[in-house]
Interface confidence: medium
């Protein structure tokens, strides 16, 4: 369905508010260092231009592609070369190479200051003074720090952000009302960003076949009553939506996401009984609700899979004649029967099934060869089950902070070349799996845990790709998307690693430690723990525990002292000396 003017088409479909929000997000994700005012100016210019095209689709330049229009606009930024260096060279290219160039320069770890939350009264004043600017600033600040954030979902977060201020700035106790809501939005936002980053990595590094396989498995778990053809249609549409968003085509992505939500709500009967409450909501909320909807109940009378996929004499015929359809149907049938399995496990099983058919359908007696294929699945199923069981037991025994520390030690020993801030960030997030998943009933633990770990390990892969330092990390990240987690789990102590020389400066602390929040204190201690392991990779758990206990005691003592700085200056070197002796 072609339009004379793409920009007019999207403006009319999305409406001015969403159009402006999405263009701001797109520009902020591309030019992450540009000041807010510059982006607002560019967005206003694009919006005015779009309005002229709505009035007359034949007007000059209205027939240009969105990439051409947006790219031309970004390339008018005066300080492009000074601020972005070689990214400015993108502007010498023609579309579609120019957009690809901009995409390649998106920075997953931009050098931006952490967002500081002002006093509640200050925020409420800013909100009341200029609500529109306040909300635009939110979109800008989140988008530039999370260049792959799912744009239509960010509009939903902004709507919730607005609602929180509208409600709480009227409340008697503004802070008690607002702060928990902002904490929730921040945490949910980080999680949403990380989940979307995995989808984009899946599409960009492993292709749309990998993404479609993921989507077949996940949607079959969610919608076990839907027929395969219905799931396939949803997968095709969902792949288009995410391909567009990951490719920077945010207007098309948001428009297609709205169409998908409309389709799902019009076809609830053939998809899931759980969609009803989502479909009564307004657009942004509806799309979010549909994405997060709980699994429908499994049909009661599902027959055994063995009949069609093991016992049938037509297995090789069906596989040969339509490989991807046959494997897709296998994945659909397996996933709808197993909401208790992680998506990654289901994909491993499909991969194992494919490998067996490749081998057996070429053999003299195919049927005899693949007759035991389901037995081969057992070790693949037991591995994540055991992993979840062991780690949940460890989490329950240690609590979150000490569980994170155990993971910090484990991962630093596996890949000590990785930077300390990355190891701390990734291990802290890996450790959050405990609180998130271990409290769930058995049937929900594995999908929660393993699919969450895949998201966190993708963050490690993305950061490592920017500055590669470890062949082991590169291997685990690039060889197989579905086997990333087992690959990292299987890594042992890196025997080839040359321990880092001891640097007393790394273990020198000051009185400012005492004013830090609990979380910031933990990060400081965990940073020291990683550095200790890098210095002594073969240190035992007991040795490390002893040093960390001494560290906590030393910090506590000095933070209670009258002259805190003098205490740190005096006790610090003693702590360092004692630690070196303990680890010798």
């Amino acid at each position: 369905d072609t339009h004379k003017s793409e920009v007019a088409h999207r403006f009319k479909d999305l409406g001015e508010e969403h159009f402006k929000g999405l263009v701001l997000v797109a520009f902020s994700q591309y030019l992450q260092q540009c000041p807010f005012e510059e982006h607002v100016k560019l967005v206003n210019e694009v919006t005015e231009f779009a309005k002229t095209c709505v009035a007359d689709e034949s007007a000059e330049n209205c027939d240009k592609s969105l990439h051409t229009l947006f790219g031309d606009k970004l390339c008018t930024v005066a300080t492009l070369r000074e601020t972005y260096g070689e990214m400015a060279d993108c502007c010498a290219k023609q579309e579609p190479e120019r957009n690809e160039c901009f995409l390649q320069h998106k920075d997953d770890n931009p050098n931006l200051p952490p967002l500081v939350r002002p006093e509640v009264d200050v925020m409420c004043t800013a909100f009341h003074d200029n609500e529109a600017t306040f909300l635009k600033k939110y979109l800008y600040e989140v988008a530039r720090r999370h260049p792959y954030f799912y744009a239509p979902e960010l509009l939903f977060f902004a709507a919730r952000y607005k609602a929180a201020f509208a409600e709480c700035c009227q409340a008697a106790d503004k802070a008690a009302c607002l702060l928990p809501k902002l904490d929730e939005l921040r945490d949910e936002g980080k999680a949403s960003s990380a989940k979307q980053r995995l989808k984009c990595a899946s599409l960009q590094k492993f292709g749309d076949r990998a993404f479609k396989a993921w989507a077949v498995a996940r949607l079959s778990q969610k919608f076990p009553k839907a027929e395969f053809a219905e799931v396939s249609k949803l997968v095709t549409d969902l792949t288009k939506v995410h391909t567009e968003c990951c490719h920077g085509d945010l207007l098309e992505c948001a428009d297609d996401r709205a169409d998908l939500a409309k389709y799902m709500c019009e076809n609830q009967d053939s998809i899931s009984s759980k969609l009803k409450e989502c479909c009564d909501k307004p657009l942004l909320e509806k799309s979010h609700c549909l994405a997060e909807v709980e699994n429908d109940e499994m049909p009661a009378d599902l027959p055994s899979l063995a009949a069609d996929y093991v016992e049938s004499k037509d297995v090789c015929k069906n596989y040969a004649e339509a490989k991807d359809v046959f494997l897709g149907m296998f994945l659909y049938e397996y996933a709808r029967r197993h909401p208790d399995y992680s998506v990654m496990l289901l994909l491993r099983l499909a991969k194992a099934y494919e490998a067996t058919l490749e081998k057996c359908c070429a053999a003299a007696d195919p049927h005899e060869c693949y007759a035991k294929v389901f037995d081969e699945f057992q070790p693949l199923v037991e591995e994540p089950q055991n992993l979840v069981k062991q780690n949940c037991e460890l989490f329950e025994q240690l609590g979150e902070y000490k569980f994170q520390n155990a993971l910090l030690v484990r991962y630093t020993k596996k890949v000590p070349q990785v930077s300390t801030p990355t190891l701390v960030e990734v291990s802290r997030n890996l450790g959050k799996v405990g609180a998130k998943c271990c409290k769930l009933p058995e049937a929900k633990r594995m999908p929660c845990a393993e699919d969450y770990l895949s998201v966190v390990l993708n963050r490690l892969c993305v950061l490592h790709e920017k500055t590669p330092v470890s062949e082991k990390v590169t291997k685990c990240c690039t060889e197989s998307l579905v086997n990333r987690r087992p690959c990292f789990s299987a890594l042992e102590l890196d025997e080839a690693y040359v321990p880092k020389a001891f640097n007393a400066e790394t273990f020198t602390f000051h009185a400012d430690m005492c004013t830090l929040s609990e979380k910031e204190k933990q990060v400081k201690k965990q940073t020291a723990l990683v550095e200790l392991v890098k210095h002594k990779p073969k240190a035992t758990k007991e040795q490390l525990k002893g040093v960390m206990d001494n560290f906590a005691a030393f910090v506590e003592k000095c933070c209670k002292a009258d002259d805190k700085e003098a205490c740190f200056a005096e006790e610090g070197p003693k702590f360092v000396a004692a630690s070196q002796a303990a680890l010798a």
Partner: nanobody, 116 residues
Framework: EVQLLESGGGLVQPGGSLRLSCAAS????????MGWVRQAPGKGLEWVST????????YYADSVKGRFTISRDNSKDTLYLQMNSLRAEDTAVYYC?????????WGQGTLVTVSS
Amino acid sequence: EVQLLESGGGLVQPGGSLRLSCAASGFTFDNNAMGWVRQAPGKGLEWVSTISANGNATYYADSVKGRFTISRDNSKDTLYLQMNSLRAEDTAVYYCAKGFRRFDYWGQGTLVTVSS
């Protein structure tokens, strides 16, 4: 080193026949399923047919069923594709490939043109 060398392509009229051959070397031919894949001008790859290692089982795409026959001679390490009742839409480069459906090696291809 695995080598697959196709031959037998050429220009043929609609309704005519051709027989493609593929000489294989560098691997144990009779341990491997083999297949044919084609690519029409400006189109993507399309699977045509597969034969099991011992030649007992053969598989065809719907578009060629009843017209094409895949066979092999394990003593000569050679794969064949007999193409009858050829149509204009069969015009393509035909590749011989090693594997069942997840082909790991391909030949250079032989061009088949069906035109009056």
